[in-house]
């Protein structure tokens, strides 16, 4: 607890002090007082630098004195032999004695009293910026007129803060300008303009004179401009060192003028005005700005239009342009929107074809569609190459956005038919020789696949069963083989309108217009064992001449059995119709003259006993295309005959091409169109 006075005596005083002693006293007087310590008696063994025995006086970290020996007062009116005056309120006294004393020493007697200190004069650092007033136990600071005491109660400054400037134009100067500005002051000025305007400050070099920087380059007095998170300055020196025109990019500006205690100059004067906030002319790739200007300011609106092949994607919606407004903060609205390359997306897949996964689906990318060769080809041309167009579609030079269509290649067997031996008199065949061959199991007959959805057959095959079961892709018609082959399900049977339906079909003598079409429920997938035969063209090139060769195939009756297990085939020449007329009907159901022969029939056979027979009906009489030797077309359909192993009659398909095309077109599905 601090005290105002006290006494300090060496151990055993006034007796001799003992050897090997160290004792300390901590003196503390109240705050605001100093300490006056005085010794009235001093008798301590003398040594050089008081190394043996001593009394030491310490103030903080400073040794105020170290005493030893004997002292006596110089003043007969005062008992004081040694004294210390410290301006601090704490003091430490330490007494030390070594292990031996040559004589008897009595030590010391000392007293301390609290004394007033003059804070205004006793210290190197002046506590007040202006006027210092001492009183017992303390001091206070005061200020000259027009100055006020800061909260620290030590510094005086002028009241130059708090001004807010809201006008769009104005002038601000340092206090007393052009007279010297007050020392030790912090002046803050605020400029607050409406949003959308930026504060622009203009100064003249000669209107600025502020105490220069120190040797380290630090301004002693300084002028600083703060706009949001941007700072201009600090500035000081003779003549304004910064830009004479400061665009702050902000509608709010704080001006801070800080001065120290020394070196007052005339100060500064500035002008400010509000400019509509500029927005940068941004470089937005792949777009054009409308209107184009050198400078854009607050409230300006531009339309940003993407170049061809680029689009603005916002959410899921793509647009080709957007509007942007210069906002009050100097930033463009919709600044996140960018013109990106149009993305055409993953290209649509096509039936019976493929498209390689593109490396990119962006504007300008190229993809290629291909058909599943050699069974399909691209019907609608265009080469299959598509590029990603500006409108976001995959576009072909010929077809535009229309997708390519892969349609079956017709009339090309995977393996050519070779007669292995001398159908009747025919040879074993493989389905790959006649991939268009269709097997009907009830009645036992044949047909020809002409595209994905249609089978051509004889009218007499389907007249009694309008829901025939058909199979493709198998050489053998054994049960285990058919189970592995492709079964075709009919959707509808179309019999030629010229075919006469009879009550008793077994007695038929008129096979004119013996042609029918079967529409399938599902498209047939083409491959090496399943592929269509072509239809004849309508030109005279497709008119058959006697001796023209054609191929027939089927599972009909052979010399050995009623029904063939494996596909049989034969190559037959076209013969004059009279050759067929001349053959005697084997099991006539009517008079020989009753049998009808018309130009809708082809007569073929008569060579080496090769002929079609019961069970081959509806199968194609395939002839090499005169305009493309790699292909076969269905010149005829197995229809009827006077006698197996002689000549046979075939429906002349060329005469029915118009009916076939019309029937297929009228009964096609949207998917097929």
């Amino acid at each position: 607890e601090p005290t105002m006075y006290g006494e300090i005596l060496s151990p055993n005083y006034p007796q001799a002090y003992p050897s090997e002693v160290e004792k300390s006293w901590d003196i503390e007087v109240p705050e605001g007082y100093g300490i006056h310590l005085y010794f009235t008696h001093l008798d301590i063994e003398l040594s050089e630098n008081c190394a043996y025995d001593s009394v030491q006086i310490i103030s903080g970290d400073t040794e105020e004195g170290r005493l030893c020996g004997q002292r006596s007062s110089n003043n007969p009116h005062s008992p004081i032999v040694e004294e210390f005056q410290v301006p601090y309120n704490k003091l430490q006294v330490i007494f030390k004695s070594d292990f031996s004393n040559e004589e008897r020493f009595t030590g010391f007697a000392a007293y301390y009293v609290a004394t007033d200190i003059n804070e205004c004069t006793d210290f190197v650092d002046v506590p007040c910026s202006h006027f210092c007033n001492n009183f017992i136990g303390g001091y206070f600071c005061s200020c000259p007129p027009e100055y006020f005491l800061h909260d620290d109660m030590k510094n005086c400054g002028v009241n130059c803060s708090g001004d807010v400037f809201t006008a769009l134009i104005g002038e601000i100067a340092s206090p007393n300008y052009p007279k010297p500005y007050p020392e030790n002051s912090r002046c803050e000025y605020q400029i607050r303009l409406e949003k959308g305007f930026q504060v622009v400050v203009t100064l003249r070099r000669e209107d600025f004179d502020v105490e220069a920087a120190d040797s380290a380059g630090n301004c002693l007095d300084s002028l600083v401009f703060v706009a949001g998170d941007r700072q201009f300055g600090p500035y000081c020196g003779h003549g304004f060192p910064g830009p004479l025109n400061i665009e702050t990019k902000s509608n709010a500006l704080d001006i801070i003028f800080q001065t120290d205690l020394t070196g007052q100059k005339k100060g500064w004067k500035l002008r400010y005005h509000g400019d509509p906030m500029p927005c940068p002319k941004e470089d937005t790739p792949n777009s054009v700005w409308e209107p184009a200007k050198a400078k854009y300011v607050f409230r300006d609106v531009v339309q940003i239009t993407c170049l061809d092949g680029f689009e603005v994607v916002e959410g899921r919606v793509g647009a080709t342009s957007f509007y942007s407004t210069c906002q009050s903060n100097g930033k463009w609205s919709n600044s996140k929107l960018k013109c990106q390359p149009v993305d055409c997306g993953i290209p649509e897949s096509i039936e019976n074809g493929k498209v390689e996964d593109p490396e990119s689906t962006l504007f300008g990318s190229v993809i290629r569609y291909t058909c599943e060769e050699p069974y399909y080809y691209m019907e609608n041309g265009g080469g299959g190459e598509y590029h990603c167009a500006g409108n976001g579609s995959w576009v072909n030079e010929v077809l535009g956005p229309e997708l390519p269509k892969c349609v079956p290649v017709c009339g090309v067997p995977r393996e050519p038919f070779e007669e292995k031996q001398r159908i009747i008199g025919g040879s074993d065949a493989d389905i790959k020789n006649f991939p268009w061959q269709v097997f009907f199991d009830n009645p036992w007959a044949g047909g020809a696949l002409i595209n994905e959805y249609w089978v051509l057959t004889a009218a007499h095959v389907v007249e009694g069963n309008r829901e025939p079961t058909m199979y493709v892709g198998s050489t053998s018609v054994q049960t285990s083989r058919l189970a592995k082959s492709k079964m075709l399900t009919p959707e509808h049977v179309f019999i030629h309108p010229g075919w006469k339906l009879l009550e008793v079909p077994e007695g038929r003598t008129n096979f004119d217009n013996d042609i029918a079409l079967v529409r399938l429920k599902d498209p047939v997938k083409m491959g090496p064992t399943v592929s269509p035969i072509c239809l004849p063209g309508t030109s005279s090139d497709y008119n058959l001449m006697d001796g023209d060769l054609g191929l027939i195939s089927g599972w009909g009756r052979t010399e050995k059995r009623d029904r063939a297990v494996r596909l049989k085939a034969a190559r037959l020449p076209v013969a004059p119709l009279r050759k067929c007329k001349e053959v005697k009907v084997e099991k006539p159901t009517a008079d020989a003259e009753a049998y009808v022969f018309t130009p809708n029939m082809i007569c073929a056979g008569g060579e080496k006993g090769m002929d079609s027979c019961k069970g081959d009906s509806g199968g194609a009489f395939a002839v090499q295309d005169p305009n493309d030797k790699t292909k076969f077309y269905a010149a005829g359909l197995v229809s009827w005959g006077p006698q197996c192993g002689t000549y046979g009659l075939y429906t002349r398909v060329k005469n029915y091409v118009d009916w076939i095309m019309k029937t297929m077109q009228e009964n096609s599905t949207p998917r097929e169109d």
């Epitope: 036992w444 049960t479 592995k484 029904r563 297990v565």
Partner: antibody
Framework: QVQLVQSGAEVKKPGASVKVSCKVS????????MHWVRQAPGKGLEWMGT????????IYAQKFQGRVTMTEDTSTDTAYMELSYLRSEDTAVYYC????????????WGQGTLVTVSS | DIQMTQSPSTLSASVGDRVTITCRAS??????LAWYQQKPGKAPKLLIY???SLESGVPSRFSGSGSGTEFTLTISSLQPDDFATYYC?????????FGQGTKVEIK
């Protein structure tokens, strides 16, 4: 009409092998697919296997895999079925059967061969 | 191999009854199923092929239906000659397999 004539009844000891023959007449073996079916006394029908001429391979029922061998001699139009490592449960009538067409499983049946396995 | 399960194993019925036998395949066999009738000491006789096609010469009282995995053989009016054992057989894929049989006996 195809006719199938099988070899006569056989009595075999367990562990032995039996070879049953089936002679085709009225057609050639090359035009046909021969299947083998057996029936144990008082039991059901069991399909044993066939030669698939299209694939050129013989297909056996899982149960007989490794014990049965089916062969054909096209020069004599005779089919053979050999079953080895006989056990008592192999006692059955063994039929050769020709495969039918267009969904009909079997066309013609042999008269059957009774194989008795007994020690 | 595809498993064929017939039910019931035995069926007692009287002349004139309508009889139904069921056959279930362990996986889809489309319509590749046949039904046989067998009498003691005789080879089986084909009744139905392709699930519903009647073999020629078979009385029309026999009919078959179904596709995929569920099939039925129906005898619309049982005749004395119909007491026998009936088998289904799948011919969808080699190996072919038979059902275990259904014995139709006189009640």
């Amino acid at each position: 009409q195809v006719q199938l004539v099988q070899s006569g009844a056989e009595v075999k000891k367990p562990g032995a092998s039996v070879k049953v023959s089936c002679k085709v007449s009225g057609d050639t073996l090359t035009e046909l697919s021969m299947h083998w079916v057996r029936q144990a006394p008082g039991k059901g029908l069991e399909w044993m296997g066939t030669f698939d001429p299209e694939e050129g391979e013989t297909i056996y029922a899982q149960k007989f895999q490794g014990r049965v061998t089916m062969t054909e001699d096209t020069s004599t139009d005779t089919a053979y079925m050999e079953l080895s490592y006989l056990r008592s449960e192999d006692t059955a009538v063994y039929y050769c059967v020709t495969e039918g067409l267009a969904g009909i499983p079997f066309d013609s049946w042999g008269q059957g061969t009774l194989v008795t396995v007994s020690s | 191999d595809i498993q064929m399960t017939q039910s019931p194993s035995t069926l007692s019925a009287s002349v004139g009854d309508r009889v139904t036998i069921t056959c279930r395949a362990s996986q889809s066999i489309s319509s590749w199923l046949a039904w046989y009738q067998q009498k003691p000491g005789k080879a089986p006789k084909l009744l139905i092929y392709k699930a519903s096609s009647l073999e020629s010469g078979v009385p029309s009282r026999f009919s078959g239906s179904g596709s995929g995995t569920e099939f039925t053989l129906t005898i619309s009016s049982l005749q004395p000659d119909d007491f026998a054992t009936y088998y289904c057989q799948q011919v969808n894929s080699l190996s072919w397999t038979f059902g275990q049989g259904t014995k139709v006996e006189i009640k």
